[in-house]
């Protein structure tokens, strides 16, 4: 960066090299060049010469003033015009940054995804700070009082093996940067209460051509948790609103859920589960598409491919169509 150059003088910023965005700032340049009484001192921002708001303070020093500085980063350097020198002589340079102090971290959430071996903690960091902001996640045992701290710049994965102070903990997040420090409220957790079951996945769908055609959705999870509650939501792709069905589930076998749907319509399905009575849900599974047949039997091997016909089946339509979900954030 600009700060690594050899200097023939000194450049400094008031109030500081990192300051609150929107502040008025002054950049001072003091020349210390042998055999040079500078005729003029020049300031450059990101390589472009500044023309205005420059004040000569004395023979060797000048000040550049900025009102309401809004750039997150800038490289500043200053030069001197020395008598008998054809080119400007570099005095010194400095990288400057503007931004905001951190907001109080809120919505601190810690979950253990089954089989992951980690407790994952996330939070809402608030507004963008524009400057380097670090987060310290504090995990304190309610049983032993031992506290672990984890330094990160976003979320944190903490090995459950390192949580040796029993099952009950307090978790809080401290945010700090050059402009300030804030701290979240303390979240009380019990490790057994924050486990999210292994992901539920819809594997296929079939519509059985009976007097009233019915669609069966096949879905499963590798969870070892005994009591699991699930929700399946579905809608016609042309609709905005979801229909939701709730299930108390035992994953010792593949689940089959029955739906009576309109013919010749493309539907989308998603499923999510939680340990019964606990706080956190899985994110919704990836989107699963299934087109119900017209009254004529129809088989679909992929929801995105053309329809294929198979007239000798009681099964009117089979789908295995997935699309990765983009709304995976519903764990609260």
């Amino acid at each position: 960066g600009i700060t690594n150059i050899n200097c023939s003088g000194h450049i400094w910023v008031e109030p500081a090299t990192i300051f609150k965005m929107g502040m008025n700032i002054s950049i001072y340049c003091q020349a210390a060049i042998k055999n040079c009484q500078p005729r003029k001192l020049h300031f450059y921002k990101n390589g472009i010469k500044e023309r205005f708001q420059i004040t000569r303070i004395n023979k060797t020093t000048a000040r550049l003033w900025y009102k309401n500085f809004l750039e997150p980063h800038a490289s500043m350097y200053c030069t001197a015009e020395c008598p008998k020198h054809f080119q400007e002589t570099l005095i010194c340079g400095k990288d400057i940054s503007s931004g905001y102090p951190p907001d109080i971290p809120d919505e601190v959430t810690c979950v253990i995804y089954e089989y992951s071996g980690n407790m994952t903690c996330t939070w809402n960091a608030g507004k963008l700070t524009y400057i380097d902001t670090k987060y310290v996640v504090h995990v304190k045992s309610l049983e032993t009082e031992e506290e672990q701290q984890y330094l990160t710049s976003s979320y944190i994965n903490i090995s459950t093996d390192s949580l040796q102070g029993g099952k009950k903990y307090l978790v809080w997040v401290q945010a700090a940067n050059a402009l300030g420090m804030e701290e979240s409220k303390q979240l009380q957790i019990h490790l057994d209460d924050i486990v999210i079951p292994s992901a539920a996945v819809i594997s296929r769908a079939e519509t059985i051509n009976a007097t009233v055609p019915k669609t069966i959705i096949y879905w499963d999870s590798q969870t070892t948790i005994e009591k699991v509650s699930c929700e399946m939501r579905y809608k016609a792709t042309t609709n905005q609103t979801w229909n939701v069905k709730e299930f108390d589930t035992n994953f010792t076998y593949v689940q089959q859920s029955e739906f009576y749907l309109e013919p010749n319509i493309k539907y989308v399905f998603q499923v999510r589960c939680q340990e019964t009575g606990k706080r956190y849900w899985q994110p919704w599974s990836s989107l699963f598409f299934h087109k119900t047949p017209e009254t004529v039997p129809q088989v679909t091997s992929k929801a995105f491919q053309h329809d294929t016909w198979n007239s000798g089946l009681t099964v009117a339509s089979i789908s295995t169509g997935h699309l990765t979900s983009d709304n995976r954030g519903d764990i609260g």
Epitope: V136, H138, K140, L142, T144, E145, E146, E147, Q148, Q149, Y150, L151, L170, W172, Q174, M181, E182, E183, Q186
Partner: antibody
Framework: EVQLVQSGAEVKKPGESLKISCKGS?????????MCWVRQMPGKGLEWMGC?????????YYANWAKGQVTISADKSISTAYLQWSSLKASDTAMYYC????????????WGQGTLVTVSS | DIQMTQSPSSLSASVGDRVTITCQAS??????LAWYQQKPGKAPKLLIY???KLAAGVPSRFSGSGSGTDFTLTISSLQPEDFATYYC??????????????FGQGTKVEIK
């Protein structure tokens, strides 16, 4: 058994700088631990000044009245914590204790013998 | 900022008396509270941690109770060596930038 040995008493003039130390033995310096400083002015109660957390990273915490007045640091390699002033005032005259449990709890099983700092012109 | 309010600030008692000192936190500190004894010219000594756990080597006449915001130190039968000043200390968290002091103001137990 953890032992904390503090540097000796100091007599200073206002405006002078000072760094006092607290050497720990028996602490597992590869584990996470808090080392804290407590002030006791003559005839007064205990006042928490701040702590340094030493673990995979180092973090310092200060009482709001001590922020900017003192600096807490530690040298893990020699198991020593420090409390320093850049410009002493007469009101800094007090007994200063370092304290720890040798772990990452905030109650103090172990205390140094105290360092008496006298600031007088 | 968590404030610790200790009462009484002083009390007079006789050997054999049951003595109770209270400490109130301005917000929930769970069971994160310690009690110390300090004698003149000496460093404080840990008596109780986690609100009710007796520190090593502390006589069983000392006991602590409470959680949340209200805590008590009890000396069941005061002994001559117990005349001293007692302090409570919140041990929840020190990372909050607004903390002024983590100790109570102290309770001086004097001979009646």
């Amino acid at each position: 058994e953890v032992q904390l040995v503090q540097s000796g008493a100091e007599v200073k003039k206002p405006g002078e700088s000072l760094k006092i130390s607290c050497k720990g033995s028996g602490i597992d310096f590869n584990s996470n631990y808090y080392m804290c400083w407590v002030r006791q002015m003559p005839g007064k109660g205990l006042e928490w000044m701040g702590c340094i957390y030493v673990g995979s990273h180092v973090n310092t915490y200060y009482a709001n009245w001590a922020k900017g007045q003192v600096t807490i640091s530690a040298d893990k390699s020699i198991s020593t914590a420090y409390l320093q002033w850049s410009s002493l005032k007469a009101s800094d005259t007090a007994m200063y204790y370092c304290a720890t449990s040798g772990s990452s709890v905030l109650y103090f099983k172990f205390w140094g013998q105290g360092t008496l700092v006298t600031v007088s012109s | 900022d968590i404030q610790m309010t200790q009462s009484p600030s002083s009390l007079s008692a006789s050997v054999g008396d049951r003595v109770t000192i209270t400490c109130q936190a301005s917000e929930n500190i769970y069971s994160f509270l310690a009690w110390y004894q300090q004698k003149p010219g000496k460093a404080p000594k840990l008596l109780i941690y986690s609100a009710s756990k007796l520190a090593a080597g502390v006589p069983s006449r000392f006991s602590g109770s409470g959680s949340g915001t209200d805590f008590t130190l009890t000396i069941s039968s005061l002994q001559p060596e117990d005349f001293a000043t007692y302090y409570c200390q919140q041990t929840n968290r020190y990372s909050n930038p607004d903390i002024y002091n983590v100790f109570g103001q102290g309770t001086k137990v004097e001979i009646k």
